[in-house]
Interface confidence: low
């Protein structure tokens, strides 16, 4: 099944050219998406090409600039945020990246009523996080790990927390592990719907072991970066949740929200907070052994000014076959009665589906069902529920948007996107205005991405927001590779794969094969999305076949496949890549003497283990920033899938699943090991230990480090990396330069 639709081809074939590495490194064929910044049911903001902030009204058709590019430029602003009362805008500048989501910045407040910046009681700098209240123009911000509140932008700040300390106590922002592995945000504070209350997390990292690595910089002496980072089995952060009344913040101060007794009895995590109303909040907690999650609904007690979380409002979600949830435990979407909610979790057949919980989880009403999975609940209105799934035509790597009418019985289901642009668009996400009056659909492929605006009642398309015309024109004279998504049936397991084939692919010829692998738990590589990237170039210009395979442990195909890797990382993921390669060889067009594998992060771990599998299938391979032992990686992630590295738990498999244990097996492959020295995520330690083991085994290998680069190897390092990897592969495959 060829997924990439045919393009408008130039009549003269000889004007077509292959992709170059330079095209990829320059981002020549990158695409744009359009996500409206909704500010009401029918209005949104968008930053124009010339950097004016423009307000659009869908119903009147009007648009006007609320903030000029001149004002933006006056403080070198790279981002903005309009207060809900539309009186002020914060302007963000001096962006300084920290970890995956976190950054610090300088903030200026611009008064739209008088066209001037607010003077007096200016915000300190740099600020770690800042946000408006959902109503009015209160500001909450985090500075030096403490939370501050302003009733109005020009007011003096009210200090909410006082115990914040760098690398010790984090208020309103997550520590490293919560940011990366639990919350996936830069913030840990949440306004109630009307801004009456502000909830926040306090993370105590006092007893967490610290990862320390050198940052070389330009000075005579390197500096040391210290991050409290709990590796598998280590002491974890201690979390507490507080809520403060922002109208009268000084009365009782922050009030702690109690932890459910069944959770508090041993190590635990806080996983998310969802406000239901101004006086009802929902917290989700997770045992350290992450197969039990508790959702706790808490109510404000006016008489005591405290938060009460009755046991009758605790809902337990437990997995008997793996960990709780998918990558994360799903979050609830509350209905208008402010007590019942919709949530995605495994049904009795082991597929993740939407359930409606009114009183107890046991009495949950299943809303969707089938041998496919519901992936995200976008919005619940009084009469509709919008969600995405991979149901359509049984392709796990697709995403379509559905609407279920919940106002009628039985509920009727409609696929909003399935037939809109069927060839071009099979992978969607959506963004809804207030009350789902309007929504934007963003299609990621397999054709050129397109963003459109729709009426929330009728689903009718109103206009195209972005169709990437320039990209379409630029690609007209490019020989793009062909792509196909198919499946292999092996021993009761379905292995979906994506194959990227050279433009002039001929089944009767033999081609070198490169396997690109990630393979981490709850990941998905085989997706119907558009991309012109490094592997597109390798197929287009260098004539390689590239394959991506979703094996056991990957997501959205049911719990049997997902939880197969539970407590056994590094086994089945590798086996399934090898199985797929054998099947590809059987197809007849693969040169079995020229097969390589490469991956990054978890993919680096899998590629390393595949190379060291002793099968003789792979001639060479690359591992970028690989995990080499699960004892070196973060507790929250690792223990979710592996349990604890203790004798009475799973220490044996922790030891058996290291790359170092297989050092001897690298003797007959060409191995390129790559890592950034300032990788805060998968520490350089991982590659250092692989290198040491290979040296000790007297095994030859190639290596490249990137000084002061993190897990993303960005900037100039990216160019160097892909150039270096290209040379390595071409040499491995005996392709001339």
């Amino acid at each position: 099944i060829v997924l990439r639709p045919p393009r408008v081809h130039n009549s003269e074939e000889n004007t077509m050219r292959a992709l170059t590495l330079k095209d990829i490194l320059n981002g020549t064929f990158s695409y744009k998406t359009f996500f409206p910044n909704w500010i009401s049911g029918q209005e949104y903001l968008h930053q124009s090409a010339d950097n004016n902030i423009v307000l659009y009204n869908i119903e009147t058709g009007q648009s006007y600039t609320i903030l000029s590019n001149r004002t933006m430029k006056s403080v070198n602003a790279s981002n903005y945020g309009l207060s809900p009362d539309r009186q002020f805008v914060y302007l963000e500048s001096d962006y300084s990246k920290l970890w995956r989501y976190s950054y610090t910045a300088t903030y200026y407040i611009y008064d739209l009523s008088n066209g001037e910046f607010v003077r007096g009681n200016e915000l300190p700098r740099p600020i770690q996080y800042l946000c408006w209240s959902p109503v009015g123009s209160k500001l909450a911000y985090v500075y030096q790990n403490n939370i501050y509140l302003k009733q109005r932008p020009g007011d003096p700040p009210f200090q909410i927390t006082f115990n914040g300390r760098e690398n010790k106590i984090f208020n309103g922002i997550p520590d490293w592990v919560y940011e990366e592995e639990m919350l996936a945000t830069k913030y840990a504070l949440w306004w109630s719907p009307n801004g009456k209350f502000l909830a926040y997390a306090e993370f105590n990292d006092t007893d967490i072991p610290v990862i320390a690595y050198s940052y070389y910089g330009d000075e005579q002496y390197p500096r040391t970066i210290n991050i409290p980072y709990p590796k598998a089995g280590a002491k974890n952060p201690f979390v507490r949740i507080f809520i403060i009344d922002t109208t009268y913040p000084a009365y009782v101060g922050p009030q702690e929200v109690p932890v459910p007794a069944m959770i508090a009895s041993s190590d635990y995590y806080f996983s998310w907070l969802t406000w239901v109303t101004d006086e009802r909040v929902c917290l989700q907690w997770l045992k350290r052994v992450q197969n039990v999650s508790v959702l706790s609904i808490c109510d404000f007690r006016e008489d005591w000014q405290t938060w009460d979380c009755p046991k009758t409002q605790e809902h337990i979600e437990e997995s008997r076959t793996g960990w709780a949830g998918g990558f994360f435990v799903s979050t609830p979407v509350f209905s208008y009665d402010a007590i019942s909610y919709y949530k995605i979790f495994s049904d009795k057949d082991g597929y993740k589906h939407i359930h409606y919980i009114k009183d107890t989880v046991e009495n949950a009403i299943q809303i969707t069902s089938g041998k496919w999975e519901a992936i995200n609940i976008f919005r619940v209105t009084q009469d509709s529920l919008f969600y995405s799934s991979n149901e359509f035509e049984d392709y796990p790597g697709r995403r379509n948007i559905y609407r279920i009418s919940i106002g009628s019985y039985p509920p009727s289901k409609k696929c909003v996107t399935c037939h809109l642009r069927k060839e071009r668009c099979q992978y969607y996400t959506a963004s809804f205005s207030d009350y789902a009056k309007y929504y934007a659909l963003v299609c990621y492929g397999p054709g050129i991405p397109i963003s459109t605006l729709h009426d929330g009642r009728t689903d009718q398309e109103i206009k195209i927001l972005e169709e990437n015309k320039e990209l379409e024109n630029a690609l007209k004279n490019i020989q793009l590779p062909k792509e196909e998504i198919k499946k292999l049936e092996v021993d009761e397991i379905t292995l979906w794969y994506k194959m990227i084939l050279p433009p002039q692919f001929d089944r009767s010829k033999k081609y070198p094969l490169l396997i690109q692998v990630y393979g981490g738990p709850c990941s998905q590589s085989v997706r119907s999305v558009f991309a012109v990237n490094w592997i597109s170039y390798l197929a287009s210009k260098e004539g390689m076949v590239i394959a991506l395979v979703d094996g056991r442990g990957t997501a959205f195909q049911g719990d049997k496949l997902l939880y197969a890797v539970y407590r056994k990382l590094g086994v089945y993921e590798v086996e399934d890549q090898i199985t797929a390669v054998r099947k590809f060889i059987e197809m007849g067009f693969i040169d079995e003497k020229r097969i390589a594998i490469w991956g990054w992060s978890y993919g680096g771990y899998v590629s390393s283990l595949a190379l060291a599998s002793g099968t003789g299938l792979f001639k060479c391979g690359i591992a970028v920033a690989p995990v080499s032992s699960w004892e070196y990686y973060a507790s929250v992630y690792t223990e979710r899938f592996m349990g604890l590295p203790t004798k009475d738990d799973n220490l044996e498999h922790y030891k058996n699943s290291t790359v170092m244990a297989r050092a001897e097996y690298f003797r007959n492959v060409d191995y390129l090991l790559i890592h950034g020295t300032a990788d805060d995520n998968v520490h350089f330690q991982n590659s250092a230990q692989i290198a040491k083991a290979l040296v000790n085994a007297q095994v030859d290998f190639q290596a490249m480090w990137y000084s002061d680069q993190n897990h993303g190897l960005s900037g100039l390092s990216t160019n160097h990396l892909y150039t270096h990897m290209t040379h390595f592969l071409k040499q491995c495959f005996s392709l001339s330069d």
Partner: antibody, heavy 123, light 107 residues
């Protein structure tokens, strides 16, 4: 160093209104991240919280006194005031102004106090 | 309102004695409890906050413990300047309330 000083008449007749002012020095009422409180202590008895005010004028009063209490703030003079109407002999007490402090554990305490002023309700 | 009950209401002790004062809350107040010392004609002075944290400048002979409903203030070795009245105060819910006081007198 923050200092608080209560001032006002030491004698008030029954049914009249007790009025006290607290002058803050060593810190600005409006630039501080704190709130300002009144607490009283009848002779030989324990302490009773009356109410508090934020620099913006937001107030909270002890429900037991709410109907009779008004606390106001004058940021230009760096002062806040207490009015207690319809007083009786039971309102005879030492009246303290105080500034509570609190931090991330959800706890707060009264860290700064005035020296107190005795108000007697008697005809 | 949360009632705070101190015991004893008064006690006699000698210099060097170990003195313990208890405070009981009418409902659980977690660790949201503070202790004050008051001398005649003076304003109260903060000793302990958050049940067990010593306010800076307060001698280490003062210590606090407890959580939930039962709390204790301990003076490990009574000094002449410690003869005073001691109050507990909860900040768990509004309004903040104080105990009735414990008077420590010279034996």
């Amino acid at each position: 160093q923050l200092q608080l000083q209560e001032s006002g008449p030491g004698l008030v007749k029954p049914s009249e209104t007790l009025s006290l002012t607290c002058t803050v020095s060593g810190g600005s009422i409006s630039s501080s991240s704190y709130f300002w409180a009144w607490i009283r202590q009848p002779p030989g008895k324990g302490l009773e919280f009356i109410g508090n005010i934020y620099y913006s004028g937001s107030t909270y009063y002890n429900p037991s006194l709410k109907s009779r209490v008004t606390i106001s703030v004058d940021t230009s003079k760096n002062q806040f005031s207490l009015k207690l109407s319809s007083v009786t002999a039971a309102d005879t007490a030492v009246y303290y102004c105080a500034r509570p402090s609190y931090y991330g554990s959800g706890n707060y305490y009264f860290a700064f106090w005035g020296q107190g002023t005795l108000v007697t309700v008697s005809s | 309102d949360i009632q705070m009950t101190q015991s004893p209401s008064s006690l006699s002790a000698s210099v060097g004695d170990r003195v313990t004062i208890t405070c009981r809350a009418s409902q659980s107040i977690s660790s949201y409890l503070n202790w004050y010392q008051q001398k005649p004609g003076k304003a109260p002075k903060l000793l302990i906050y958050a049940a067990s944290s010593l306010q800076s400048g307060v001698p280490s002979r003062f210590s606090g413990s407890g959580s939930g409903t039962d709390f204790t203030l301990t003076i490990s070795s009574l000094q002449p300047e410690d003869f005073a009245t001691y109050y507990c105060q909860q900040s768990y819910s509004t309004p903040p309330t104080f105990g009735q006081g414990t008077k420590v007198e010279i034996k």
